[in-house]
């Protein structure tokens, strides 16, 4: 029997300060350039070394950004989302959704880290 892949979805508020290397990440997605099928959301595609996001450590590639400084990113064209970030100012508050893949083994299988009961 094969294992099943589940996802643990969590949300987090991340406050970043635009430093000398900027916020330091790239995005994909938007209503005109969907990154995920049937989802026009904005996703983190790259985190740059020495940028504010990398130094903070919480934002991850693949995270979905739900809002910037309280402004919802739903149903935005890609460029409009980019402009929102670029005009967000020095202190930037991000509401993000992390999607962690959880591998469940076959029924009856005890993983190495499981307590022996």
């Amino acid at each position: 029997m094969n294992g099943r892949v589940d996802y643990l979805v969590t949300e987090e508020e991340i406050n970043l300060t635009r430093g000398p290397s900027g916020l330091g990440f790239n995005i994909v997605g938007g209503t005109d350039q969907q990154y995920v099928s049937n989802d026009s959301g904005i996703y983190v595609s790259r985190i740059k070394e020495n940028g504010a996001a990398a130094l903070d450590g919480r934002l991850q590639e693949g995270d979905k950004i739900l809002s910037v400084n309280g402004q919802d990113l739903k149903n935005l064209l890609h460029q409009d989302a980019v402009d929102l970030f670029r005009n967000a100012g020095y202190a930037v508050s991000l509401r993000v959704q992390h999607r962690l893949q959880v591998q469940n083994g076959p029924i009856g299988h005890r993983g190495e880290g499981d307590p022996s009961g």
Partner: nanobody, 127 residues
Framework: HVQLVESGGGLVQAGGSLRLSCAAS????????MAWFRQSPGKERELVAD????????YYRDSVKGRFTISRDNAKNTVYLQMNGLKPEDTAVYYC?????????????????????WGQGTQVTVS
């Protein structure tokens, strides 16, 4: 395999014009924009102009504003750089580049690392 091929470079007198072209071939990519960079001897490669693939947004570095125009033809997978009023300081190798995402930072933070695919370059010399 994605390929970007530049053409249109050459030798021109100050005040003259050139039109650079960059043709993209290979697998269809969900590109977010294409750009022209330039590099002169002993200097870092610098972003000259960028156009979003949707065409709704363009950027120009200050020194070329009003003289250079970037445009794209999605049907032909080609990006152009029309360069008018050329100056000797525009002399450089010009590179076409494509990006598969967008930086969230203002343009002064954007650089070589934000672009994923590169052409081989075409020489522009202004005498």
């Amino acid at each position: 395999h994605v390929q970007l091929v530049e053409s249109g470079g050459g030798l021109v007198q100050a005040g003259g014009s050139l039109r650079l072209s960059c043709a993209a071939s290979g697998p269809s990519m969900n590109w977010y924009g294409m750009a022209w960079f330039r590099q002169s001897p002993g200097k870092e490669r610098e972003l000259v102009a960028d156009v979003s693939w949707s065409g709704g947004s363009t950027y120009y570095r200050d020194s070329v504003k009003g003289r250079f125009t970037i445009s794209r033809d999605n049907a032909k997978n080609t990006v152009y750089l029309q360069m008018n009023g050329l100056k000797p300081e525009d002399t450089a190798v010009y590179y076409c580049a494509a990006r598969t995402s967008s930086s969230v930072d203002p343009w002064n933070y954007v650089g070589v690392g934000d672009y994923d695919y590169w052409g081989q370059g075409t020489q522009v010399t202004v005498s």
